[in-house]
């Protein structure tokens, strides 16, 4: 997606992108797991939520996340008919009023309680590098993706399109 110039073209476009509708175009309730089939789980500890990446026991129930999909205009130089340049952005909410947020300063992924309209830190560009896997790229920091680091979710910088296929930024969605 980034070509020879890395993320430069894309960085400008993402910062300029705007969500075209305030309501989501579609929503899914799904469990989130890593490329290696570890589950993403959420636990309430000391009045705040922690996010874990772990192997579940055989019959343990997977946590569900509400993924809300928004269309976003992608400014581009392509000579389209106004239709081109749409991206899908998602917000991820494991429980009412809490959303995953990108903390770019700490390179961390956190759960924050907030009201709508959600801040840009809660929006992630949806990528399908493989048909059954998705990646989530920070709207606020193009080229930075949600990934797995030391059994936690973290923000991981991806500097070329080849690295978009690295397993630690690939996730599986399961609606069952």
């Amino acid at each position: 997606a980034f070509g020879i110039s890395g993320v430069q073209k894309y960085t400008r476009a993402l910062h300029d992108s705007s969500i075209t509708g305030i309501s989501p175009i579609t929503e899914y309730l799904a469990s989130l797991s890593t490329y290696n089939d570890q589950s993403i789980t959420f636990a309430l500890e000391d009045e705040s939520y922690e996010i874990y990446v772990e192997d579940l026991k055989k019959d343990e129930k997977k946590d569900k996340v509400l993924l809300s999909y928004y269309e976003s205009q992608h400014p581009s130089n392509e000579s389209g008919d106004g239709v081109d340049g749409k991206m899908l952005m998602v917000t991820l909410s494991p429980t009412k009023d809490f959303w995953l947020h990108a903390n770019n300063k700490e390179h961390s992924v956190e759960l924050h309680k907030c009201e709508k309209p959600l801040p840009d830190q809660a929006f992630f560009v949806l990528h399908n590098m493989h048909s059954n896997c998705v990646s989530f790229e920070c709207k606020t920091d193009p080229g930075v993706f949600i990934g797995v680091k030391d059994n936690h979710l973290a923000l991981i910088k991806v500097d070329s399109s080849e690295n978009l296929c690295t397993e630690n930024i690939l996730f599986k969605l399961s609606e069952t």
Epitope: T26, V83, N128, C165
Partner: antibody, heavy 122, light 107 residues
Framework: QVKLLQSGAALVKPGASVKMSCATS????????VSWVKQSHGKGLEWIGE????????NFNENFKGKATLTVDKSTSTAYMELSRLTSEDSAIYYC???????????????WGQGTLVTVSS | NIVMTQSPKSMSISVGDRVTMNCKAS??????LAWYQQKPGQSPKLLIY???NRYTGVPDRFTGGGYGTDFTLTINSVQAEDAAFYYC?????????FGGGTKVELR
Amino acid sequence: QVKLLQSGAALVKPGASVKMSCATSGFSFTDYWVSWVKQSHGKGLEWIGEIYPNSGADNFNENFKGKATLTVDKSTSTAYMELSRLTSEDSAIYYCTRGPYYYSTQIIFAYWGQGTLVTVSS
Amino acid sequence: NIVMTQSPKSMSISVGDRVTMNCKASQNVGNNLAWYQQKPGQSPKLLIYYASNRYTGVPDRFTGGGYGTDFTLTINSVQAEDAAFYYCQRIYNSPPTFGGGTKVELR
């Protein structure tokens, strides 16, 4: 403007293979999933599969696994589909299509090529 | 695979009529549904996606509705150029499947 230009009609013998092309222009080829759709009188519209030029990842309808092979040439922004071991059941119009979204496949077909007619006959 | 069933198979209408066609999914598909129009000798064209979102450039006389298993495409005040086949398609999940189509012809 977005264009998907497909190769011309093909008349092929049973048991043979055919490879058709879909030359694209007007958009960033590597950033969109390309799908192929079959239209026949007997079965209507059927999705064959899709390919993402950026990663080379593909995804097939089970009914077409082993029948269709999808490839791309990023240097010419062209997608290809090869159909093997052809029978009369494969006689149809084949369309290449593209979705509305950068980077993501929702298997929605926003742009279509003009179609390639394949006739299998001895 | 989820089966998409369209009804009626064909309908004969007059210019200015309001027409509604149906698409039924064999399982709940949420709002993961698209509608296409295909005129003779042409490729299909996307009209509606995610059940009710009109695609860019599609006239506002085309309206999609429904959720779950039952969906409709309505054409308000049909124009002569609307004579075509209309197909519904389940989107998002693989494999996407199409309905058999509804033929709309002018009287």
